[in-house]
Amino acid sequence: ESALITQQDLAPQQRAAPQQKRSSPSEGLCPPGHHISEDGRDCISCKYGQDYSTHWNDLLFCLRCTRCDSGEVELSPCTTTRNTVCQCEEGTFREEDSPEMCRKCRTGCPRGMVKVGDCTPWSDIECVHKESGTKHSGEVPAVEETVTSSPGTPASPCSLSG
């Protein structure tokens, strides 16, 4: 289950703070990996593997760790200072306009088109017209029209916004 808020969403209170860890707030802020207590007098550690905070903050609680969905692989686990990093499984990708799920990459390009970009965890294969070189983002073509391609290897993790 993905958290619905990231600390970026809650960022307007952030401001520069000294870079040493302390058990009491520094200039009203607690260090990454902590949140502020209800009375504002203490910094309370986030729970490893359960929640986190990424910035100096005066949040009254830590943010929930993202749980990778089925169809995703965990690239790095949640720590007290960094959220889980999830990535779509090989052969699937996550589009910016539908970040809630990984979709299967197309297996090939329509007839008259050539593949110029592999399937990555954040993009489908890229096809262009042989002559004009213009991109195509149409529906998955019928099987007999496809040119087989193999999924690309991940280059870098796609970041989940929560």
Epitope: I5, G28, F61
Partner: antibody, heavy 122, light 112 residues
Framework: QVQLVQSGAEVKKPGASVKVSCKAS????????MNWMKQSPGMSLEWIGR????????FYNQKFKGKATLTVDKSTSTAHMELSSLRSEDTAVYFC???????????????WGQGTLVTVSS | DIVMTQSPLSLPVTPGEPASISCRSS???????????LHWYLQKPGQSPQLLIY???NRFSGVPDRFSGSGSGTDFTLKISRVEAEDVGVYYC?????????FGPGTKVEIK
């Protein structure tokens, strides 16, 4: 625009329970605490406690622990407060109000519901 | 708990004239972080309270500039530079420096 709309007035007998609701709209419900206040007839305001819709945590004024139970239904962006073992001194107008998730800006209430009158009478 | 007191409890005012309400706390409201968490609300007749001033002197959005807040430590003041008819109601001070948060008894402002 931000709106907090509360349920209607209630008349209850001593010993009964009552559940007051507060439906939020015009903002991200999970992005703010929901607080509850009590205003007894002709009296000032008392802060009862608050609910964190993001993680389900509650934080109560010690005085109202055991009297008030705060919950939310995220699917309908509605906060609830249940008052148990009602007595005549629970007769009051109850308000919901939102506050920020930060310590520095979390102690004041920028939007309030219209209030719900709960009358306890035999 | 922190006890908030206000004076006067009733304030008859003349439209166009200034008005001032005092609020005192039983302990200093200066937090260890240096900030002071004293706020003012107005409850107009038959309505819910509305935020006027937060953290001593900051006007909430949409609040006319005739309202101003000042003070420090345990003594605070809300001033209305020129009272208008729509300003009638009960004014409450509130503190969130110490848990639990508490409110003053209110000052009822009415037109003479």
């Amino acid at each position: 625009q931000v709106q907090l709309v509360q349920s209607g007035a209630e008349v209850k007998k001593p010993g009964a329970s009552v559940k007051v609701s507060c439906k939020a709209s015009g903002y991200s419900f999970i992005g703010y605490f929901m607080n509850w206040m009590k205003q007894s007839p002709g009296m000032s305001l008392e802060w009862i406690g608050r609910f964190n819709p993001y993680n389900g945590d509650t934080f109560y004024n010690q005085k109202f622990k055991g009297k008030a139970t705060l919950t939310v239904d995220k699917s309908t962006s509605t906060a609830h407060m249940e008052l148990s073992s009602l007595r005549s001194e629970d007769t009051a107008v109850y308000f919901c109000a939102r506050s920020a998730y930060y310590f520095d800006s979390g102690g004041y209430f920028d939007y309030w519901g219209q209030g719900t009158l709960v009358t306890v009478s035999s | 708990d922190i006890v908030m007191t206000q004076s006067p409890l009733s304030l008859p005012v003349t439209p166009g004239e200034p008005a001032s309400i005092s609020c005192r706390s039983s302990q200093s409201l200066v937090h260890s972080n240096g900030n002071t968490y004293l706020h003012w609300y107005l409850q107009k007749p038959g309505q819910s309270p509305q935020l006027l001033i937060y953290k001593v002197s900051n006007r909430f959005s949409g609040v006319p500039d005739r309202f101003s807040g000042s003070g420090s430590g345990t003594d605070f003041t809300l001033k209305i530079s020129r009272v208008e008819a729509e300003d009638v109601g009960v004014y409450y001070c509130s503190q969130s420096t110490h848990v639990p948060w508490t409110f003053g008894p209110g000052t009822k402002v009415e037109i003479k």
